[in-house]
Interface confidence: medium
Amino acid sequence: VKMAETCPIFYDVFFAVANGNELLLDLSLTKVNATEPERTAMKKIQDCYVENGLISRVLDGLVMTTISSSKDCMGEAVQNTVEDLKLNTLGR
Amino acid sequence: EICPAVKRDVDLFLTGTPDEYVEQVAQYKALPVVLENARILKNCVDAKMTEEDKENALSLLDKIYTSPLC
């Protein structure tokens, strides 16, 4: 179960913020109808990544990847998949 | 649906203290350079963002979590 499959829009926004890509961030935020104050808030977070340089993006990306692929999340994802399978089976 | 552990990480990044956030990160990735980086990012966000900014970021996260794309 890939982490991005659990909530793709979250990871789109996270990696746009962490990569310092303003265009990508705008595109991702448009998909969830972000208001102007919400966009401003996210750009302030993005500024911190940009100011701290490439390694900051890499290291925080590692944290997010590690949490997302940890037992805490993978167990959850597997459980959700089992529940989905049960529902699909019952629905037939 | 977003994993609760990821949600907790993001919530602490915005609303927790630097120590709380770094402690949370340490549970998953305890490399010294990673923890140092986490603290610096957290301190930067706390310095740049007003309470209103943080509320706006949290309301955006709610939109993300409840989006059909999540």
């Epitope: 701290n52 340089g53 390694i55 590692l62 | 990735k29 010294p32 350079v33 140092e36 610096i40």
Partner: antibody, heavy 120, light 107 residues
Framework: QVQLQESGPGLVKPSETLSLTCTVS????????WSWIRQPPGKGLEWIGY???????NYNPSLKSRVTISVDTSKNQFSLKLSSVTAADTAIYYC??????????????WGQGTLVTVSS | DIQMTQSPSSLSASVGDRVTITCQAS??????LNWYQQKTGKAPKFLIY???NLETGVSSRFSGSGSGTDFTFTISSLQPEDVGTYYC?????????FGQGTKLEIK
Amino acid sequence: QVQLQESGPGLVKPSETLSLTCTVSGGSISSYYWSWIRQPPGKGLEWIGYIYYSGRTNYNPSLKSRVTISVDTSKNQFSLKLSSVTAADTAIYYCARHRVTRTADSFDYWGQGTLVTVSS
Amino acid sequence: DIQMTQSPSSLSASVGDRVTITCQASQDINNYLNWYQQKTGKAPKFLIYDASNLETGVSSRFSGSGSGTDFTFTISSLQPEDVGTYYCHQYGDLPYTFGQGTKLEIK
């Protein structure tokens, strides 16, 4: 291919300040952490400290009061200063690059090392 | 500081022998351990990261294992070019620390 080259005086008098520079070629200094490590003749390795291109540093507590590491991104160089030296600071001084991956933090590239002798 | 204790401090083996070096950490370091090889008059060379992962381009006769506090470095079939001193290095906590080294010679 990344290459690191240490430079500086090979002889320093006791109580003076040891100054070394590491020049990085074949890659940018801006994307990594960079360390100084030393090795007294015939002995083991001791980490001195690291620097990130932004100027952020972390030093070994055993040397912290005497160490300063700085960076000059325009020259792709980082430097070490060790004050109040004694004969115990006689060592080969290496500069090295950190490679940080998801679970690892390694010194993947090293300079060839420069011997610094503390003697009057 | 985390103390790293290597053993033996020196060893002599014949070409083709299987050679094992151990490294013990004074506290749990997960698998945050590297191994380096240093030949006389040269800078250390990075061999293994994460306790057991071989660095790209390093011979597969080198291997590592262990987690927590006890780690092992193995050369499956000793070659003349393997002569040198081997160091373990922990990066689980600052300051980074190294083992005192194991000097490997050919009989």
